[in-house]
């Protein structure tokens, strides 16, 4: 930091601002009677170069001229773009201990002349806005560069504004502060930008425009929508616009959508009727404006109006299924289940369901409303029953869906054949089948139904089902399918008044079970041993168990155990074996097998048969 140049002066030739690649000569001169006090000949002038306040070079070797003890000239080259500081210091060589004393300094700026400004673009926001222009300045000059924006137009209209660029601010936009009015709509205006700095100047090409070219209307405001007769599909969108607007663009979409519906409206005067809205749907609406049909620019989009369309009565039909169980000698319990309508069918908040159960011949009718998606009733086992369900919102009810209550697995001739279940990936199972061989009535549809093979409440854990057309023989089930859980899957073939079904077990992913069955008892009856067990707890099965294995060997024997493999049936919890010798102590245990492998062994039990085996 140099306060004042008391000891001397520093000058630069040709100038303190030079083009990139040029050299400069820096002269450092001592004022009269300044310098080292006793021996002027011992005066040594040195030049130090600083970039960003950091000393980068001592230019001692760049001296090109020297008046011993009075002045020195140094040549500097290869200066980088921007500003470089040079400081001249006096070094009194007889006094080694004193540091050099600053004499004076100079800043040299290296830069380039400005390029002609390009891509001039002018806008006036709204009819009452002011004209602002922006441009591309071209390459950075590294020097303070002044820009002048000049506008000329009809009736000797002239106007200009200035700004500058340097290393702290950039000038590429100016607001002229004048307003062009619609009565000048046909007039032509010319703007040009001139750039000037210490190394030169340049001018843009003239840019010509009209009022319509540059005026961008303000975006519409105060947007609202009025639904005609509380309709969920028809509404009138209304808004405020600037007076000169002749064209609007409307865009609207449901909030969860990714594509807009676009509409152009000419001379809309702030009003437009929409007829294709979805009832009970959150929509976002935006509007843009233009002052001329062919020319001019669109305004920015307005702020969004977000609103929900009103409800309309539900459409579509409910997907109904049921479960039938005899609960005493002459009564059955019918549990009806149905799937919720999707939003485009519900068209509102479903308030309740209307359920009807009717005995066709005696005309007995049970009716109720429920807010749940299931309904259970006890009815006589006799008679032909039909059920119907409809969904109601605040505007009305859907058409009732009817289903005949038949014995779902009552007709063997309607049972589908060759049912298989194959795991496709972690969360679905492919079920395939062949049609019934000798159905005496046509299959109207197939229902694939599945339930987890683990304890559940009949009403809290409803079945999952898929309706399949009669010409399809496969279904990919994925709803509520979890890995490592075994599902019982039924394929129902339904005719008008009968049903037949086939069952299979399946899982989407399996592991070997965590443990084997627990042997609870071994009893001897008629020269046979009966092994009884408790099943593996459901969480430990880890898929569908294919079979159990009972192992036995003589106690203390090192031989391989013998084994008996039993097809897994949940209802079975004991099995006879008859190849054990009497009065020999055996060790027995069990394992379980899934498609992934065998479980570790369950508990061991010792038993010594008493009777005559075989």
């Amino acid at each position: 930091n140099i306060d004042v140049c008391k000891l001397g002066t520093v000058t630069v030739q040709p100038a303190p601002v030079i083009p990139l690649g040029s050299a400069a000569n820096i002269s450092c001169s001592l004022n009269p009677k300044q310098g080292c006090s006793h021996y002027p000949s011992s005066n040594e002038l040195i030049l130090l170069k600083f970039v960003n306040d950091v000393l980068v070079e001592n230019l001692h070797g760049k001296k090109v001229h020297d008046h011993t003890g009075h002045s020195s000239t140094f040549q500097v080259t290869n200066l980088s773009l921007g500003m470089t500081l040079f400081v001249c210091k006096l070094n009194c060589s007889n006094s080694q201990k004193k540091p050099p004393v600053p004499v004076c300094g100079v800043e040299i700026s290296v830069g380039v002349a400005p390029e002609p400004p390009q891509n001039i673009s002018c806008v006036q926001e709204g009819e009452n806005g002011t004209v602002a222009c922006s441009w591309n300045s071209g390459k950075v000059t590294y020097l303070k560069t002044n820009y002048t924006l000049q506008l000329s137009g009809p009736n000797n209209l002239t106007c200009q504004k200035q700004c500058f660029s340097d290393n702290r601010q950039n000038c590429n936009r100016l607001d002229l502060g004048i307003n062009l009015s619609p009565d000048l709509a046909e007039s032509r205006f010319i703007v040009r930008v001139t750039a000037i700095n210490d190394l030169g100047n340049s001018s843009s090409l003239p840019h010509t425009f009209t009022f319509l070219d540059i005026v961008i209307p303000l975006p519409p405001w105060d947007i609202r929508i009025n639904f005609l007769n509380a309709s969920g599909s028809r509404g009138t969108l209304q808004w405020e616009d600037e007076g000169q607007v002749v064209l609007n663009q409307l865009r609207y979409q449901p909030l969860n959508s990714t594509s807009w519906n676009m509409v152009n409206a000419t001379n809309a005067k702030g009003k437009y009727d929409l007829r294709d809205l979805r009832p009970f749907t959150e929509y976002e609406f935006q509007i843009s404006s233009k002052l001329h049909l062919s020319g001019g620019s669109w305004s920015n989009w307005s702020e969004s109006l977000r609103t929900r369309t009103p409800e309309e009565e539900p459409v579509g039909i409910l997907d109904i299924w049921y479960m039938k169980q005899d609960i005493d000698y002459d009564r059955q319990q019918i549990s009806l289940f149905w799937k919720s309508l999707n939003p485009s069918e519900a068209r509102g908040k479903i308030l309740h369901y209307q359920v009807t159960l009717q005995e066709v011949t005696k005309k007995t009718t049970l009716q109720n409303t429920t807010r749940h998606t299931s309904w259970t009733r006890v009815i006589p086992r006799t008679g032909a029953w039909t059920a119907s369900v409809s969904a109601a919102n605040s505007k009305g009810a859907s058409a009732p869906t009817h289903i005949n209550i038949v014995d779902l697995c009552g007709t063997g001739l309607l049972a589908p054949h060759q049912v298989s279940a194959k795991s496709e990936n972690m969360d679905n199972i492919l079920v395939t089948w062949q049609p019934p061989k000798k159905a005496d009535s046509a299959v109207r549809e197939y229902i694939v139904e599945w339930r987890a093979l683990q304890p559940g409440s009949i009403t809290k854990f409803p079945p999952h089902w898929l309706r399949i057309p009669p010409d399809n023989m496969s279904a990919l089930i994925s709803e509520n399918i979890k890995p490592y859980i075994c599902y019982e899957i039924r394929v129902h073939a339904l005719s008008e008044s009968q049903g037949g079904c086939s069952s299979i077990r399946g899982d989407s992913k399996h592991k070997a079970p965590v443990s084997g069955p627990h042997i609870t008892a071994i009893t001897e009856k008629k020269e046979r041993l009966f092994i009884s067990w408790t099943h593996i707890p459901f969480p430990e099965q880890r898929g569908c168990i294919l079979h159990y294995r009972i192992y036995w060997k003589e106690r203390d024997s090192t031989a391989q155990p013998e084994l008996c493999e039993i097809q897994y049936r949940r209802s079975q919890n004991s099995h006879p074996i008859s190849s054990l010798q009497p009065r020999v102590t055996y060790v027995l245990w069990m394992t379980a097998v899934t498609a992934a492998g065998e479980s570790p062994q369950g508990n061991e039990r010792e038993f010594c048969p008493q009777g005559k085996a075989n």
Partner: nanobody
Framework: QVQLQESGGGLVQAGDSLRLSCTAS????????MYWYRQAPGKQREFVAY???????NYLDSVNGRFTISRDNAENSVYLQMNSLKPEDTVVYYC?????????????WGQGTQVTVSS
Amino acid sequence: QVQLQESGGGLVQAGDSLRLSCTASGSIFAIDDMYWYRQAPGKQREFVAYITATNSANYLDSVNGRFTISRDNAENSVYLQMNSLKPEDTVVYYCNAKQIVGFQIDEYWGQGTQVTVSS
């Protein structure tokens, strides 16, 4: 396994009331559908009332309006409030629970409680 224990039976006059209780214990996490049945000597067991997980109830026609089934989930209990009892209500009342595994319904029964209504 699930164990069911009934209580509350007894001898009452026609027109009186009784409240039967049934408490469930054991593996009851999936027991939501609870029933009352009754059985007279030499007759088949008949359904009286049930209550579902969603507290939907249904009754045998002859007891509808006189009997009310209710439940207390915190106590794992189900109740049968019997009003305006008649001599023909004299039978053994059984508590029943049903749960489903796959498509098989497992049933659990209490040991029964005797209700006697004298005229």
